[in-house]
């Protein structure tokens, strides 16, 4: 039985050209996290964080995706095309897969303020 819950940074906004941190946290389970995958709205993989082996940033994103903090991901040099859904997928044993959703809005306005909060989707 899957007892865990994923907390995420929820809906966030950030300035074009700036950076943003995507964060997820798995709680309420004793399952072993073997891998965390970060995916974009079109289901392309951004990065994999393997529990033992560390980070693999996908080649297409190497120049503007940075690992961390923690199991999170930092997106840099944001463009308007980065607006959309992001998913953290926790692969665990023996529970299986947990998935969290974050919506990022990239704003043109120079006065756009980065807003973030942890929430349970």
């Amino acid at each position: 039985m899957m007892t865990g819950t994923i907390e995420t940074t929820g809906n966030i906004s950030a300035k074009k050209g700036g950076s943003v941190i995507l964060q997820c946290h798995l709680s309420s389970t004793m399952a072993q996290v073997t891998q965390v995958n970060w995916e974009q709205h079109d289901h392309s993989l951004l990065a994999i964080r393997n529990a033992e082996l560390g980070w693999h940033i996908y080649p297409a994103f190497k120049d503007r995706v940075a690992p961390g903090p923690g199991l999170g991901l930092t997106l840099q040099s944001l463009t308007m095309n980065d607006t959309g859904e992001y998913f953290c997928t926790y692969h665990t044993y023996p529970d299986g897969t947990y998935r969290g959703r974050i919506f990022l809005e990239v704003l043109e306005s120079s006065v756009a303020e980065h807003s973030a909060r942890f929430q349970i989707p």
Partner: antibody, heavy 120, light 107 residues
Framework: EVQLQESGPGLVKPSETLSLTCAVS????????WNWIRQPPGKKLEWMGY???????YYNPSLKSRITISRDTSKNQFSLKLSSVTAADTAVYYC??????????????WGQGTTVTVSS | DIVMTQTPLSLSVTPGQPASISCKAS??????VAWYQQKPGQSPQLMIY???YRYTGVPDRFSGSGSGTDFTLKISRVEAEDVGVYYC?????????FGGGTKVEIK
């Protein structure tokens, strides 16, 4: 260049423990991930598990109760032990390196493989 | 575990002609797929990673494509040295799993 060489007995009796060693040259096993992969006759390649640069291990759940992967950094080698073997463990066994940072779970260096037969 | 299914089982190709190998995943693996070539009497060699990126030294006649559940390895012009068995592998989630292989032969 990275080179891997498997060694160990080619014949193991049922219920005994299969033991193989992989000697690594041209690269330190305190970097990257060091894997065992096998292929039974006529079947798919099966990833068995790995030991990481830090010495942590991860095993395929299908083998978890029988498999141990360890390392000897002074000899730059790592080893596989598989207990309670049956005929189903007859396979070509490969040791392999995986550079996770650059290639994810894709294996970039393989040993030449060693055939192990389980038979009485 | 994720099951990787390759088609066809074997392929006989005239030199200079193209060849295409398919790999289907039992669930969405995004682009976490690698392809290997195993020549007769040798161990597998990495050809493609992240579904479409050629590994160092791999000739540009080899290309990988696909995402989600359907992946393809293409050889634009088959040469005699391309004979062997080709395997796909997913690393979207552990345990990482392989396809059953496709044998490429020369006519």
């Amino acid at each position: 260049e990275v080179q891997l060489q498997e060694s160990g007995p080619g014949l193991v009796k049922p219920s005994e423990t299969l033991s193989l060693t992989c000697a690594v040259s041209g690269y330190s096993i305190t970097s990257d991930s060091w894997n065992w992969i096998r292929q039974p006759p006529g079947k798919k390649l099966e990833w068995m598990g790995y030991i990481s640069y830090s010495g942590n291990t991860y095993y395929n759940p299908s083998l978890k109760s029988r498999i141990t992967i360890s390392r000897d950094t002074s000899k730059n080698q790592f080893s596989l032990k598989l207990s309670s073997v049956t005929a189903a463990d007859t396979a070509v066994y490969y040791c392999a390196r995986l550079d996770f940072s650059n290639y994810g779970g894709a294996v970039d260096y393989w040993g030449q493989g060693t055939t192990v037969t389980v038979s009485s | 575990d994720i099951v990787m299914t390759q088609t066809p089982l074997s392929l006989s190709v005239t030199p200079g002609q193209p060849a295409s190998i398919s790999c289907k995943a039992s669930q969405n693996v995004r682009t976490a797929v690698a392809w290997y070539q195993q020549k007769p009497g040798q161990s597998p060699q990495l050809m493609i990673y992240s579904a479409s990126y050629r590994y160092t030294g791999v000739p540009d006649r080899f290309s990988g494509s696909g995402s989600g559940t359907d992946f393809t390895l293409k050889i634009s012009r088959v040469e005699a040295e391309d004979v062997g068995v080709y395997y796909c592998q997913q690393y979207y989630t552990t345990p990482w799993t392989f396809g059953g292989g496709t044998k490429v032969e020369i006519k």
